[in-house]
């Protein structure tokens, strides 16, 4: 009656185009056009004494320009935020994060591997202190960098004795087919190992650990 | 009752402090104070007909405020650029990159692990086509994520028969104590393996590979 | 697999990537959208106000033949 | 470490990457500093201009006892 | 390795992270919101000034029958 | 799989992380420089307007001896 034991698998582990809003209007054109169309009476009645009405035209022109400029600036930032793209070559280049300084960023999630061995509770506290949580595996596609992680590290998966299920720190249940749980040891906590394997371990046993911060 | 045991798979894979310039001035206070102090004659001479001089005081106030605002905004951006920090809690949060989409970003370097097995030349060409190069190991500190990489992957290290040295694609010589070179087979290319080990391999042998893009 | 043919020289090195970046904002999309909208509205208000302010009014002289200086038009 | 057997050719090297990155977006520090300075100067010009424009001038009434409407002061 | 004493309960879970971000720049939400608001206020001040400047007022002629040109109203 | 030894209590679970983030600036150097320049031009337009508005002009009284109030100069 064979245990299903994971064999090694061959594995593996991208700017908003700014449509340059061609503001092809010369300043003279702009102000002249506005004066001709919008301020004919003002022009004839108040130009020589520089009344407030005449001044209004200038303000209108200036503010109209400022309106276009500000909308353009904010739109650029907004569109970039919306599409998560950089307007530079290559178009597939983008920033990742934000993450704590010197953490690994992959598909807008942040990861850090910690060398020191701690039990599960200490590992969890360590991640918490850095505004993160222990590793949660939620997608083989979005987290395929985990395929090539060596060794065994605490993750945020715990066993719930009342219903026998495995549950993440956030209360969500472990999705089927995400991890191969290998129960060769007794415990209520789990270690992550390469190729999406989870090894059950006594929560009090010291192990290295992986912290994760989800930004998306 | 079978134990679920995973089989291994071979794998390839930042405010500018805004000293809130307490603009705690009601509009009326603001304009009144400026009129009293800055425009006494304007007040006495031109209030009732709302001359341009009176209007000027308002413009001055408004533009003074705008000056403060704009300098603050730009200063914040400038300081951020200067110190490479996030103005949010924690101060150590930052973005990483830019990197090609869906690459791993760590300490502003970009990495990607590729599943498909290619010889060294093909691997190099693949990285080149993505504006990157094969992995270059230049610092155990800046690249400590490489410690936990499973399996064996082509990197940009080649042997120069004329002087017997190991050299990176960019022509730089392999620094001592960076990699432990292990000559498992006869060859002029090297595979990267966990814990900063380099395994000599024939350049024509197909292997998975790691591409890298340095942004710093 | 065959070994590629002879190579006569060492690498001609690529100048690489030269993007620069450090640190990045903290605005959510809804907030950013709100800010853009607010700024747009404020600017339009200004433009609208100056048009209204610049609008010619009927002269009181048209009513009684007298010139009232700094008096509101009564038409 | 032993030296691997001779090879008749070396790999043709990829041009590599050697970019540099600092700042957010794609502004260099000098450029950003220049932009800040330019905006500050423009704003100060505006403030200065309105103060000059708002500066009281000697009334022509003090000269000849007559009120000149919309005439430049002659003192 | 010695095994730490048994634990009687399951882990007390951490509240996680909830930072949000989009775009570039380095302004915190409160600051950026304040700056935008301040800019809006500055713009509105201009609007207010335009309205004040353009607003017709009661003529001082109604007081003493004389026309005071460019004199403050005494009422 | 057998159920590991009983535990006396269950975790107080955290709702996880819900931050969101996307992208870092999207303005190229030429574009951003252009926008800043355009803003500067807008500001200078205002300055120009103020100067024009404050500039003393020749009185129309010098033309025909009459005072034309709020009438365009005819010379």
């Amino acid at each position: 009656m064979g245990w299903i034991r994971g064999r090694r698998s061959r594995h593996s582990w991208e700017m908003s185009e700014f449509h340059n809003y061609n503001l092809d209007l010369k300043k003279s054109d702009f102000s002249t056009r506005w004066q001709k169309q919008r301020c004919p009476v003002v022009k004839s009645k108040c130009r020589e004494n520089a009344s407030p009405f005449f001044f209004c035209c200038f303000i209108a022109v200036a503010m109209g320009i400022r309106f276009i400029i500000m909308v353009t600036i904010w739109s650029a930032v907004f569109l970039n935020s919306l599409f998560n793209q950089e307007v530079q070559i290559p178009l597939t280049e983008s920033y990742c994060g934000p993450c704590p300084k010197n953490w690994i960023c992959y598909k807008n999630n942040c990861y850090q591997f910690f060398d020191e061995s701690k039990n599960w509770y200490e590992s969890q506290a360590s991640c918490m202190s850095q505004n993160a949580s222990l590793l949660k595996v939620y997608s083989k596609e979005d987290q395929d960098l985990l395929k090539l992680v060596k060794s065994y590290h605490w993750m945020g998966l715990v066993h719930i004795p009342t219903n026998g299920s495995w549950q993440w720190e956030d209360g969500s249940i472990l999705s089927p087919n995400l991890l191969t749980i290998i129960e060769m040891q007794k415990g209520d906590c789990a270690l992550y190992a390469s190729s999406f394997k989870g090894y059950i371990e006594n929560c009090s046993t010291p192990n290295t650990y992986i912290c994760m911060q989800r930004t998306v | 009752m079978g134990w679920i045991r995973g089989r291994r798979s071979r794998h390839s894979w930042e405010m500018s402090e805004f000293h809130n310039y307490n603009l705690d001035l009601k509009k009326s206070d603001f304009s009144t104070r400026w009129q009293k102090q800055r425009c006494p004659v304007v007040k006495s001479k031109c209030r009732e007909n709302a001359s341009p001089f009176f209007f000027c005081c308002f413009i001055a106030v408004a533009m003074g405020i705008r000056f403060i605002i704009m300098v603050t905004i730009w200063s914040a951006v400038f300081l951020n650029s200067l110190f490479n920090q996030e103005v949010q809690i924690p101060l150590t949060e930052s973005y990483c990159g830019p990197c090609p989409k869906n690459w791993i970003c760590y300490k502003n370097n970009c990495y990607q692990f590729f599943d498909e097995s290619k010889n060294w030349y093909e691997s190099q060409a693949s990285c080149m086509s993505q504006n990157a190069s094969l992995l270059k190991v230049y610092s155990k500190e800046d690249q400590d994520l490489l410690k936990l990489v499973k399996s064996y992957h082509w990197m940009g290290l080649v042997h120069i028969p004329t002087n017997g040295s190991w050299q990176w694609e960019d022509g730089s010589i392999l620094s001592p104590n960076l990699l432990t070179i292990i000559e498992m087979q006869k060859g002029d290319c090297a595979l990267y393996a966990s814990s900063f080990k380099g395994y000599i391999e024939n350049c024509s042998t197909p292997n998975t590979y790691i591409c890298m893009q340095r942004t710093v | 697999q065959t070994t590629p043919g002879e190579r006569s020289s060492l690498p001609a090195f690529y100048p690489g990537t030269s993007g620069s970046c450090s640190g990045c904002g903290s605005l959510s999309l809804p907030l950013l959208a709100g800010l853009v909208a607010a700024d747009a509205v404020a600017s339009l208000l200004i433009v609208g106000a100056v048009f209204l302010c610049a609008r010619p009014r009927r002269s009181p002289a048209q009513e009684d033949g007298k010139v009232y200086i700094n008096m509101p038009g009564r038409g | 470490q032993t030296t691997p057997g001779e090879r008749s050719s070396l790999p043709a090297f990829y041009p590599g990457t050697s970019g540099s990155c600092s700042g957010c977006g794609s502004l260099s520090l000098p450029l950003l500093a220049g932009l800040v300075a330019a905006d500050a100067v423009a704003s100060l010009l505006i403030v200065g201009a309105v103060f000059l424009c708002a500066r009281p001038r000697r009334s022509p009434a003090q000269e000849d006892g007559k009120v000149y409407i919309n005439m430049p002061g002659r003192g | 390795q010695t095994t730490p004493g048994e634990r009687s309960s399951l882990p007390a879970f951490y509240p996680g992270t909830s930072g949000s971000c989009s775009g570039c720049g380095s302004l915190s939400l409160p600051l950026l919101a304040g700056l935008v608001a301040a800019d809006a206020v500055a713009s509105l001040l201009i609007v207010g000034a335009v309205f004040l400047c353009a607003r017709p007022r009661r003529s001082p002629a109604q007081e003493d029958g004389k026309v005071y040109i460019n004199m403050p109203g005494r009422g | 799989q057998t159920t590991p030894g009983e535990r006396s209590s269950l975790p107080a679970f955290y709702p996880g992380t819900s931050g969101s983030c996307s992208g870092c600036g999207s303005l190229s150097l030429p574009l951003l420089a252009g926008l800043v320049a355009a803003d500067a031009v807008a500001s200078l337009l205002i300055v120009g307007a103020v100067f024009l508005c404050a500039r003393p002009r020749r009185s129309p009284a010098q033309e025909d001896g009459k005072v034309y109030i709020n009438m365009p100069g005819r010379g």
Epitope: R7, R8, M184, K186 | R8, S9 | - | - | - | T2
Partner: antibody, heavy 118, light 108 residues
Framework: EVQLVESGGGVVQPGGSLRLSCAAS????????MHWVRQAPGKGLEWVAF????????YYADSVKGRFTISRDNSKNTKYLQMNSLRAEDTAVYYC???????????WGQGTLVTVSS | QPVLTQPSSVSVAPGETARIPCGGD??????VHWYQQKPGQAPVLVIY???DRPSGIPERFFGSNSGNTATLSISRVEAGDEADYYC???????????FGGGTQLTVL
């Protein structure tokens, strides 16, 4: 510190029986699987048997199936190997070892010698 | 049952690098573990999961696993490294732990 101490070895005639014990300390015995591995004089290591942490699963080498029985008493932090129908080829030093993830043996005892001879 | 083939002996001069191979069909698909056994002593785990070193094991010990051969490498060999070295895998088909025949390392 993890300690594994084997006992119960000795000389026994072919066909005889012997019970080996392994006392464990320094770790949570009830949480880990345990192995018996033997080494004939001048020979290499040969895996003999494995028992899961809760005793629910036991595995044996083909050469000892039906003759040897592995068991454990978690309350006593001890595991056992009951050897029946002993043969001359069973003569070896028997090592007790702690399992890790069902893959490798991370701690070993010093061994106890079992001699099957007439 | 997989057969792990090891040479009975390997000799190396002090300061040199010793390489002890362990052959087996598709061995690269399995985790290979290595044990050192000095005369009269119990075996000690020196490498697990192909190339991981337990705490306390010198950095001179390296493991690799590729193709049909796993290799234990010991750089800058010292006299104290003289011992028998065994490779081991878990046979998931037969639920057995399999050891190689062992290699005696001699430091010349």
């Amino acid at each position: 510190e993890v300690q594994l101490v084997e006992s119960g070895g000795g000389v026994v005639q072919p066909g005889g029986s012997l019970r080996l014990s392994c006392a464990a300390s320094g770790f949570t015995f009830s949480s880990y699987g345990m192995h018996w591995v033997r080494q004939a004089p001048g020979k290499g290591l040969e895996w003999v048997a494995f028992i899961r942490y809760d005793g629910s699963n036991k595995y044996y080498a083909d050469s000892v199936k039906g003759r040897f029985t592995i068991s454990r008493d978690n309350s006593k932090n001890t595991k056992y190997l009951q050897m029946n129908s002993l043969r001359a080829e069973d003569t070896a030093v028997y090592y007790c070892a702690k399992d890790r993830f069902g893959y490798y043996l991370d701690y070993w005892g010093q061994g106890t010698l079992v001699t099957v001879s007439s | 049952q997989p057969v792990l083939t090891q040479p009975s002996s390997v000799s190396v001069a002090p300061g040199e690098t010793a390489r002890i191979p362990c052959g087996g069909d598709d061995i690269e698909t399995k985790s290979v573990h290595w044990y050192q056994q000095k005369p009269g002593q119990a075996p000690v785990l020196v490498i697990y999961d192909d190339d991981d070193r337990p705490s306390g094991i010198p950095e001179r010990f390296f493991g690799s696993n590729s193709g049909n051969t796993a290799t234990l490498s010991i750089s800058r060999v010292e006299a104290g490294d003289e011992a028998d070295y065994y490779c081991q895998v878990w046979d998931d088909n037969n639920d057995e732990w399999v050891f190689g025949g062992g290699t005696q390392l001699t430091v010349l």
